[in-house]
Interface confidence: low
């Protein structure tokens, strides 16, 4: 039985050219996290964090994606094309797969603020 919940940074906004942290947190379960996948809105993989083997950032994003903090991901040099959905997929044992959603809006405006508030989707 899956008892856990994924908390995410929810809907966030950030300035074009700036950076943003995508963060998910799995709570309310004792399950072991074996792998976390980070996907972009078009289903392309940004990165994988394997518990035993470490981080892999996919080649297309190597210049603009940094691993961490923790199991999160830092997107740098943001462009307007980065606007959209991002998904964290937590592979856990024995529970199975948990999935969280974050919506990132990249703004031209200087008033954009990065919300660090966690939400349960």
């Amino acid at each position: 039985m899956m008892t856990g919940t994924i908390e995410t940074t929810g809907n966030i906004s950030a300035k074009k050219g700036g950076s943003v942290i995508l963060q998910c947190h799995l709570s309310s379960t004792m399950a072991q996290v074996t792998q976390v996948n980070w996907e972009q809105h078009d289903h392309s993989l940004l990165a994988i964090r394997n518990a035993e083997l470490g981080w892999h950032i996919y080649p297309a994003f190597k210049d603009r994606v940094a691993p961490g903090p923790g199991l999160g991901l830092t997107l740098q040099s943001l462009t307007m094309n980065d606007t959209g959905e991002y998904f964290c997929t937590y592979h856990t044992y024995p529970d199975g797969t948990y999935r969280g959603r974050i919506f990132l809006e990249v703004l031209e405006s200087s008033v954009a603020e990065h919300s660090a508030r966690f939400q349960i989707p």
């Epitope: 899956m2 994988i48 083997l53 797969t97």
Partner: antibody
Amino acid sequence: EVQLVESGGGLVQPGGSLRLSCAASGFDFSSYGVPWVRKAPGKGLEWVGYIDPIFGPTYYADEVKGRFTISADDSKNSLYLQMNSLKTEDTAVYYCARDYSYGYAYALDIWGQGTLVTVSS
Amino acid sequence: RIVMTQTPLSLSVTPGQPASISCQASQRISPYLAWYLDKPGQPPQLLISRASKLASGVPDRFSGSGSGTDFTLKISRVEAEDVGVYYCQSYYVHTSSGYAFGGGTKVEIK
């Protein structure tokens, strides 16, 4: 054209060895998982093993563990399956197949035509 | 080790009629479930990935659904070219069990 071509199959006596090759063309071999799958006469598809393309470790089905070894040569865009201590139950058509999006789908979109391995005295 | 159980073992369908194949995983594998069609003398062909994503070039009479441990492949109107053995396949990322295939379902035309 994206394709996989297997070679090296043939007739071998029980206890003998055989080395299968899988040559890839039309895509960057090192960016994809390329598992070996076999189909024995009158039986279903059975996964044999693969090299994790991202992190490097090899994984094998219990039935072949300790007897089969998978290796890759990225410069030749080729994959190899070294089969030792062959048993009659290893008789099958052996396929290599491309995992089209490792970490996202784990689904095999390109298959070779297969090479027949017959283990018999 | 993960076990994939397919039902039924065989299916005889009248052309133009629907068909449905079920696949149950011994552990939660969502979303990593794929379906293949295996015809004699040919390598298997990917039909569906990620439980419901239609593979390139596959007719839209094929559809996949399900999550967690229970999955279904449906053919809305079976055609003669659809005969063969259908396999489900999963990947369980938590262990080294690799690509696990179901036992197969043979589809024939009445």
